[in-house]
């Protein structure tokens, strides 16, 4: 058993049918010595008396808010949560496996630049009685500071019969140098509590590996005289690290017809302009990627050919 | 993804082309190592990230773009100084800091070259003959060092009398390649920045 926060405790259980569970001793936070009784949640049934209460925690029915009283007055509370270990592996019931970029990916994180700021998100089908708390650091043995905000519900989607909820959090490394070569990964830890179930999820990454630039901005077309060709031009996104000559991007320019089946013409360039043939009803899209370290491509920025 | 091959103008900063070749070569070598050594811990998540140049050179600090010198987090240590005569210093405007930066890059390349050559000698003794260093990568390191053209004492190749532990050598190769790729990215950024300056 360990303390998650004041008066909230997590009991770790080896979870299998007929498991013996864990013996837990609760102590009433009071100078009083006698006349103390214990109850669980809203029930008025007295579970025991005395300054301490010994219970065998086996199932969720044994978890909850234990309260010690004296003469009708509440002295203190202890909330017991359960953390299930199923055959040596901690349960992952609360969050959905996003399966990207690989199986057992519960937390996904992205950064728009090298400033040390990043966003993580996760999915669940649970809509109520759900709380998250997020901590982060650079490295784990001698951790350096990363400050995270509160997790917020950022999107709701309908998936088949189920509703899916997306939560996200923004974090900022306290003293980040955009040019630094990372040798210790960022660690992100999310505590999730659903009703009386506790779970924790972690992700470990280098900022360089989660970079995804914003799409190029100011995408414009300039028709070339007496030609079907157009000059496409764009600019680096505002959110990208500066100076751009140091943090350079490379670009992919795509001409896509109305039909998805039509052949896509693609050109790669390090410049912020390109000359392409603009077909009728086609659209021109441009996306960006770090020129020197191949992390994710940005989303496409698009303009119609007409 | 293959990086686009740059064909520099004669007036272009002479080292940019070489640094792009270097990044391409080390990235290819790392990819090959990850595939060949699939049963060894060779991915970024599995290895310890060690920097053999730590406390010996200060490339990131010495080569920091001017725009980032206002960022206190980027100014940890800028004390290291090096010999300052190199052929990449194409214009007279080149500052002392630029010379320091390029000489730090040269020292990095020299250190990695020695490590890679020592390692290759060990890998050639492996009866499995599983993996060797790409000669192209070693040649590209050499070309960039020649382009930088700093005078510096030659570092003797380390020779080891004990029987090599091939498992450890292959893991060390992965660690070295990951670190060198990261440094090659920094070198490429620096060359691109200097070329634009």
């Amino acid at each position: 058993i360990w303390e998650l926060k004041k008066d909230v405790y997590v009991v770790e259980l080896d979870w299998y049918p007929d498991a013996p569970g864990e013996m837990v001793v609760l102590t009433c936070d009071t100078p009083e010595e006698d006349g103390i009784t214990w109850t669980l949640d809203q029930s008025s049934e007295v579970l025991g008396s005395g300054k301490t209460l010994t219970i065998q925690v086996k199932e969720f029915g044994d978890a909850g808010q234990y309260t010690c009283h004296k003469g009708g007055e509440v002295l203190s509370h202890s909330l017991l949560l359960l953390h299930k270990k199923e055959d040596g592996i901690w349960s992952t019931d609360i969050l959905k496996d996003q399966k990207e970029p690989k199986n057992k990916t519960f937390l996904r994180c992205e950064a728009k630049n090298y400033s040390g700021r990043f966003t993580c998100w996760w999915l669940t089908t649970i809509s109520t009685d759900l709380t998250f708390s997020v901590k982060s650091s650079r490295g784990s043995s001698d951790p350096q500071g990363v400050t995270c905000g509160a997790a917020t519900l950022s999107a709701e989607r309908v998936r088949g019969d189920n509703k899916e909820y997306e939560y996200s959090v923004e974090c900022q490394e306290d003293s980040a140098c955009p040019a630094a070569e990372e040798s210790l990964p960022i660690e992100v830890m999310v505590d999730a509590v659903h009703k009386l179930k506790y779970e924790n999820y972690t992700s470990s990454f280098f900022i360089r590996d989660i970079i995804k630039p914003d799409p190029p901005k100011n995408l414009q077309l300039k028709p070339l005289k007496n030609s079907r060709q157009v000059e496409v031009s764009w600019e680096y996104p505002d959110t990208w690290s500066t100076p751009h000559s140091y943090f350079s991007l490379t670009f992919c320019v795509q001409v896509q017809g109305k039909s998805k089946r039509e052949k896509k013409d693609r050109v790669f360039t390090d410049k912020t302009s390109a000359t392409v043939i603009c077909r009728k009803n086609a659209s021109i899209s441009v996306r960006a990627q770090d020129r020197y370290y191949s992390s994710s491509w940005s989303e496409w920025a698009s303009v119609p050919c007409s | 993804r293959n990086l686009p091959v740059a064909t520099p103008d004669p007036g272009m900063f002479p080292c940019l082309h070489h640094s792009q070749n270097l990044l391409r070569a080390v990235s290819n070598m790392l990819q090959k190592a990850r595939q060949t050594l699939e049963f060894y811990p060779c991915t970024s998540e599995e290895i310890d990230h060690e920097d053999i140049t730590k406390d010996k050179t200060s490339t990131v600090e010495a080569c920091l773009p001017l725009e980032l010198t206002k960022n206190e987090s980027c100014l940890n240590s800028r004390e290291t100084s090096f010999i300052t005569n190199g052929s990449c210093l194409a214009s007279r405007k080149t500052s002392f800091m630029m010379a320091l930066c390029l000489s730090s890059i040269y020292e990095d390349l020299k250190m990695y070259q020695v490590e890679f050559k020592t390692m290759n000698a060990k890998l050639l003794m492996d009866p499995k003959r599983q993996i060797f260093l790409d000669q192209n990568m070693l040649a590209v390191i050499d070309e960039l060092m020649q382009a930088l053209n700093f005078n510096s004492e030659t570092v003797p190749q380390k020779s080891s009398l004990e029987e090599p532990d091939f498992y450890k050598t292959k893991i060390k190769l992965c660690i070295l390649l990951h670190a060198f790729r990261i440094r090659a990215v920094t070198i490429d950024r620096v060359m691109s920045y200097l070329n634009a300056s």
Epitope: W15, P17, A19, D87, I89 | -
Partner: antibody, heavy 115, light 112 residues
Framework: QVQLVQSGGGVVQPGRSLRLSCAAS????????MHWVRQAPGKGLEWVAF????????YYADSVKGRFTISRDNSKNTLYLQMKSLRAEDTAVYYC????????WGQGTMVTVSS | SYVLTQPPSVSGTPGQRVTISCSGG????????VKWYQQLPGTAPKLLIY???QRPSGVPDRFSGSKSGTSASLAITGVQAEDEADYYC????????????FGTGTKVTVLG
Amino acid sequence: QVQLVQSGGGVVQPGRSLRLSCAASGFTFSSYGMHWVRQAPGKGLEWVAFIRYDGSNKYYADSVKGRFTISRDNSKNTLYLQMKSLRAEDTAVYYCKTHGSHDNWGQGTMVTVSS
Amino acid sequence: SYVLTQPPSVSGTPGQRVTISCSGGRSNIGSNTVKWYQQLPGTAPKLLIYSNDQRPSGVPDRFSGSKSGTSASLAITGVQAEDEADYYCQSYDRGTHPALLFGTGTKVTVLG
């Protein structure tokens, strides 16, 4: 004490269907994940499928994906394996088992796919 | 498609020590715990070892398990005639959990 009693096995022709049941008692069935495991005659153990405690997630071996469906009825304390498009290579003893560091197995039920 | 490899058979005389190996990889045994099962002819498998080296109550102490790196082993110290059975190791793969990964199985024969 924990008990898993299996039923539903038998002889079936290729291409036909069969449903296996596993009735649980002696524990809170709705709190635990469940597996199906099979063993072809003279061969080793092969995992078939898993279902979460609440039925929210199901996982299958590639060899049965799209043909077999694992399900559970927590109100009846029963686990099921619906098998469709049966093949000769599905001939085996099928076991249900609880998920956890200590597990309990059903007695097994024989499924023979033969024309 | 078994990823955990066991020797097809091992044998010993009563009182001898026999060991069965179970060889896997970094993503299965290297990252997860190992179980061992005993299966007597015509019966369901019975758990002998869980969490690499833990014995459930009721399992004789002549059975012991261990794990090192990407392989595990089961030792029967002072093998007895009633130990003649098939033995299977089991683990998970970190990418496909909760799918059970079984070993190829080992037939233990007690001679004499």
